[in-house]
């Protein structure tokens, strides 16, 4: 019968030792047994549970020439980079015949400098705005005391008086570094150093100062920026679109915004070369040497209507007896709003001017008084929007109409000069 088949006779001649060390340590546990006959497979237990994926090696040495002679079996369990999860009671286990044998236990313990589970992270904060930082460390040995540092200077050092895992900072006015030190019976470890960058606060009260058809003047109140003066503010504008869905807090519009920089102070900017009677969304952020603030919410604004920038085109006026037929086309120049209609004025050499509102039609037949005897009759036309009348056309003389002839068309030879229209405005 193989050695160790009786319950009281253990085959183990060497039991696992003890390992105590710091995180990252590499160590080996070893157990040795002497058996008669075929050597068994050695299993390792941690806290009574078989380790399925153990990094173990087994060496078997026969003590005789016969298979039934004794064998020395050595099993080694390698622990690489010791962690808290490796700690516990270790034993070897073998099955011999119908019996199970377990070695005496060895213990693996972790003891060293504090180990950081959480360290303060770099972040940006608005000036004078509260925030929290986290730091967490563990042993063993416990307890672990934390000491918070700002710019490497302790914040609270009296035991039990300082903050532990979470540090509440009521606000900063300058970019600062924060770290924590963890103290236990084995020593002190310093965390990484987190840089907290102080950015300007978000500007407030973005509003319109004045509106013109192609120009908006906007102003805002800057937020606090700590010890760092603001260098400039950046305004973004985007053409509004009903389907665009810019909400108050929506971070970005779906199309590329158009950007303009403003020197500060004053905290004001004139946006020119805009489309009249057009909705926009605008927002502003201000920048210091440390970086930009967050953007304000998108503010919906709209340029007002303007008057048409040019007169109606291709005006023709023909006369047939006591009737005059006048025809024109919409102005080629920008209307700067919604066209509400046309006004027409006609006048003879010695007669008072007659003014008519034609509405949106582009032709009219005039009934002339005095049986058409009025001489040198001329016609002018202007387009208008809600903002008022655009420029009048040059006077067009009434031509006599002869059957078989096309109605004469008078091209305007001179128009009021239109302002140069350029997009974008920045």
């Amino acid at each position: 019968a193989p050695r160790g088949t009786q319950a009281e006779e253990s085959p183990f001649v060497g039991n696992p030792g003890n390992i105590t060390g710091a995180r990252g340590l590499t160590g080996t546990l070893r157990c040795q047994l002497q058996v008669q006959g075929e050597p068994p497979e050695v299993h390792w237990l941690r806290d009574g549970q078989i380790l399925e994926l153990a990094d173990s090696t087994q060496t078997q040495v026969p003590l005789g020439e016969d298979e039934q002679d004794d064998w020395i079996v050595v099993s080694q369990l390698r622990i690489t980079s010791l962690q808290l999860s490796d700690t516990g009671q270790y034993q070897c286990l073998v099955f011999l015949g119908h019996q199970t044998f377990v070695s005496q236990p060895g213990y693996v313990g972790l003891e060293g400098l504090p180990y950081f589970l959480e360290e303060p992270e770099d972040r940006t904060v608005a000036a004078n705005t509260p925030f929290n930082l986290s730091c967490q460390a563990q042993g063993p040995p416990e307890p672990v005391d934390l000491l918070w540092l700002q710019d490497a200077v302790p914040l609270a050092t009296a035991p039990g008086h300082g903050p532990q895992r979470s540090l509440h900072v009521p606000g900063l006015n300058k970019t600062s570094s924060f770290s924590c030190e963890a103290h236990n019976a084995k020593g002190v470890t310093t965390s990484r150093t987190a840089t907290i960058t102080v950015l300007p606060q978000q500007p407030r009260n973005l509003h319109l100062v004045s509106r013109q058809p192609t120009e908006l003047e906007v102003a805002w109140t800057p937020g606090l920026s700590g010890i760092y003066p603001l260098t400039h503010c950046t305004l973004q504008a985007v053409l509004s679109d009903d389907g665009m869905g810019i909400q108050a807090g929506e971070p970005d519009p779906p199309e590329e915004p158009l950007t303009s920089q403003a020197s500060v102070p004053p905290h004001q900017l004139r946006l020119g070369s805009l489309h009249p009677h057009t909705p926009y969304h605008i927002r502003v952020a201000c920048t210091s040497s440390q970086g930009p603030s967050s953007w304000t919410h998108w503010l919906p604004v709209e340029t007002p209507e303007g008057v048409p920038l040019g007169p109606p085109e291709n005006i023709s006026a023909t006369r047939n007896g006591s009737q005059a037929f006048v025809h024109w086309q919409e102005p080629r120049a920008p209307l700067q709003g919604t066209l509400l209609g046309y006004r027409l004025a006609y006048q003879g050499q010695d007669t008072p001017e007659v003014l008519m509102d034609i509405g949106l039609r582009q032709e009219v037949t005039l009934e002339l008084q005095g049986d058409g005897s009025v001489s040198n009759l001329t016609v002018c036309v202007a387009a208008y929007t809600a903002a008022g009348d655009g420029p009048w056309s040059l006077p067009v003389p009434l031509e006599a109409w002869r059957p078989g002839q096309a109605q004469p068309v008078h091209q305007l030879v001179k128009e009021p000069s239109t302002p140069a229209f350029s997009w974008p405005w920045w």
């Epitope: 710019d151 302790p154 050092t157 035991p159 150093t193």
Partner: antibody
Framework: EVQLVESGGGLVQPGGSLRLSCAAS????????IHWVRQAPGKGLEWVAG????????YYADSVKGRFTISADTSKNTAYLQMNSLRAEDTAVYYC????????????WGQGTLV | DIQMTQSPSSLSASVGDRVTITCRAS??????VAWYQQKPGKAPKLLIY???FLYSGVPSRFSGSGSGTDFTLTISSLQPEDFATYYC?????????FGQGTKVEIK
């Protein structure tokens, strides 16, 4: 004005004992610790022991562990270094320095005492 | 323990020179490095802490930089009173360990 003054140095036989004192003024030991640093003749600086500003721990260099003991009497604002089983290689000027935090560096030092 | 290796061990320089001393840690110490100046027969004086913070009262010609394992102390324009021995020290963990020192001598 912050000041640290060491005393207690002197000539001692190998195997003998000495107790160094470090009297602090201008600050209190509450929330502050003390380092002991030594400098052998013509050599560099070597940290010996320390009491940190938090907890109730004491730390030692491996070279003195089991032989030296650091302590502090907050009522007297004085730190001590009890040195037993002294060896020839312990010969040095011993400085005490303030320990506010490890990261802050040793910002105030005493003038040193020769052992 | 973390080893701190300073270079050079000594250097000769003239007043007005720019002097650079380097220190290398045997493992990452983040920015936990201090620099000290020591004159013969005197206690060391703190110059720089946390790698780059100038200690109160130290002239601005002294500056520190670096993180991880490589650190530098720079004296932008050497003055007569700057001839001394300079030590780096890691403060990442206990035991705090010092470099072997760099002696700055008059050329």
């Amino acid at each position: 004005e912050v000041q640290l003054v060491e005393s207690g140095g002197g000539l001692v036989q190998p195997g003998g004992s000495l107790r160094l004192s470090c009297a602090a003024s201008g600050f209190t030991f509450t929330g502050t610790g003390i380092h002991w640093v030594r400098q052998a003749p013509g050599k560099g600086l070597e940290w010996v022991a320390g009491i940190p500003p938090v907890g109730s721990y004491t730390y030692y260099a491996d070279s003195v562990k089991g032989r030296f003991t650091i302590s502090a009497d907050t009522s007297k604002n004085t730190a001590y270094l009890q040195m037993n089983s002294l060896r020839a290689e312990d010969t040095a000027v011993y400085y005490c320095a303030r320990w506010r935090s490890l990261s802050s560096g040793m910002d105030y030092w005493g003038q040193g005492t020769l052992v | 323990d973390i080893q701190m290796t300073q270079s050079p061990s000594s250097l000769s320089a003239s007043v007005g020179d720019r002097v650079t001393i380097t220190c290398r840690a045997s493992q990452d110490v983040s920015t936990a490095v201090a620099w000290y100046q020591q004159k013969p027969g005197k206690a060391p004086k703190l110059l720089i802490y946390s790698a780059s913070f100038l200690y109160s009262g130290v002239p601005s010609r002294f500056s520190g930089s670096g993180s991880g394992t490589d650190f530098t102390l720079t004296i932008s324009s050497l003055q007569p009173e700057d001839f001394a021995t300079y030590y780096c020290q890691q403060s990442k963990t206990t035991p705090p360990t010092f470099g072997q020192g760099t002696k700055v001598e008059i050329k």
